[in-house]
């Protein structure tokens, strides 16, 4: 048993790291392996996690991680049984995909606005709580030629439209991503969509 | 929001020993490490050790070696740190923090004066 | 003996500027992250900067931190009369066992 893809980590700088790898072969992740993962810190314990399946000769594991910071750096070691496959470490501060935005409303009572708020993923206290910047993806099914990008670099997780860009009539869907700067992360995953119907028109000309 | 209460002040013959407790509140226990650090009257602070409330693994500073211990309960969410063989120079401010690389909160200190 | 050296104390008058050095060696700040902590007289300490240059929220932006090689520095802008206090660096040795240091501290005067 051999590893083919050796395995990368990404965190979500809160509480989940994820290493995916390939094995050389179909492999049953959960009953053959164990990836164990240790930070080097004083009094710091091994942590055992059990891989899933993720295709036929993938395997994904989801590292529980508690008070990540930019210092944290985690020992990782791959066993099958009794042999080690793989001896690798992993530096979350290094390695940073977000989690993704949600609870993504949009408020079409508001005047002539199309107003989208969402919640940040990150509880005030976290490093990234103040440091997300989002990316909101506006389009529209009825019109496939409309799609649009939406960067909010402030730290509010609000966006408004004037209603009057939109086309009068049609269905939207909008959903946001963030990434944190300082911290040099990957895109989120996108939030789930959310759809609202334009019928905004515009006032006759006196 | 987090709260790190102290036990109260103590006053300690030398050669006794002392245990100062530290109750954690407002956060998930067992995912932080607490510190121990003392301040002498006038002076700087001093690193003693470190506990991880997971598992109860603790790491001390080479001069306390052997003098003092960490301890925690889950169910209460408290850490103890008890010093022993006790000398006047040990009479300070004892301080418990969560954190881990820094120290985020800290608790009030607890003054242990040592006198015969 | 801390190996991470302040100076005693500094003073400024309210509205000037401010800066605290810490000084330490290649096993330590050279090779770590450095904190800034405030103590308030008869107060516990309080977490100003962490990671060199990161401010925990809800302190203010007067306050910033940077590092260079092995040598740290703490600056206050617009100095408050309640800024009056004794701040400690604090970082990592590196050098066997990992432990964390604190400097000698610097008692600030607002004037």
């Known amino acids: 048993m051999k590893v083919l893809q050796e395995p990368t980590c990404v965190s979500d700088y809160m509480s989940i790291s994820t290493c995916e790898w390939k094995m050389g072969g179909p492999t049953n992740c959960s009953a053959e392996l164990r990836l164990l993962y240790q930070l080097v810190f004083q009094s710091s314990e091994t942590h055992t996690c059990v891989p899933e399946n993720n295709g036929g000769v993938g395997c994904v594991c989801h590292l529980l991680m508690d008070d990540v910071v930019s210092m944290d750096n985690y020992t990782l070691d791959l066993w099958a049984g009794q042999q080690l496959l793989w001896k690798g470490s992993f530096k979350p501060s290094e390695h940073v995909k977000p989690r993704a935005p949600g609870n993504l409303t949009v408020h079409t009572n508001v005047s002539d606005t199309v107003l989208l708020t969402w919640s940040n993923p990150y509880p005030p206290d976290n490093y990234l709580y103040n440091d997300l910047t989002y990316a909101v993806n506006i389009w529209s099914e009825n019109d496939p030629a409309y799609s649009r990008i939406h960067n909010v670099t402030y730290l509010k997780p609000t966006l408004r439209i004037p209603a009057s860009t939109l086309k009068s009539g049609i269905s939207y869907r909008a959903r946001v991503r963030a990434w944190a700067q300082h911290y040099n992360t990957t895109w989120s995953e996108w939030s789930p969509s959310t759809k609202w119907y334009n019928s905004y028109r515009e006032p006759f000309e006196q | 929001q987090v709260q790190l209460v102290q036990s109260g002040a103590e006053v300690k013959k030398p050669g006794a020993s002392v245990k100062v407790s530290c109750k954690a509140s407002g956060y998930a226990f067992t995912s932080y490490y607490m510190h121990w650090a003392r301040q002498a009257p006038g002076q700087g602070l001093e690193w003693m050790g470190i506990i991880n409330p997971s598992g109860g693994s603790t790491s001390y500073a080479q001069k306390f070696q052997g003098r003092v211990t960490m301890t925690r309960d889950t169910s209460t969410s408290t850490v103890y740190m008890e010093l022993s063989s006790l000398r006047s120079e040990d009479t300070a401010v004892y301080y418990c923090?969560?954190?881990?690389?820094?120290?985020?909160?800290w608790g009030k200190g607890t003054l242990v004066t040592v006198s015969s | 003996q801390s190996v991470l050296t302040q100076p005693p104390s500094v003073s400024a008058a309210p509205g000037q500027k401010v800066t605290i050095s810490c000084s330490g060696g290649s096993s330590n700040i050279g090779n770590s992250y450095v904190s800034w902590y405030q103590q308030l007289p008869g107060t516990a300490p309080k977490l100003l900067i962490y990671?060199?240059?990161k401010r925990p929220s809800g302190i203010p932006d007067r306050f910033s931190g940077s590092k260079s090689g092995t040598s740290a520095t703490l600056a206050i802008t617009g100095l408050q009369t309640g800024d009056e206090a004794d701040y400690y660096c604090g970082t990592w040795d590196t050098s066997t066992t990992m432990y964390p240091l604190f400097g000698t501290g610097t008692k600030l005067t607002v004037l």
């Open positions: 990671d060199n240059n």
């Open positions: 923090a969560r954190g881990k690389w820094w120290f985020y909160d």
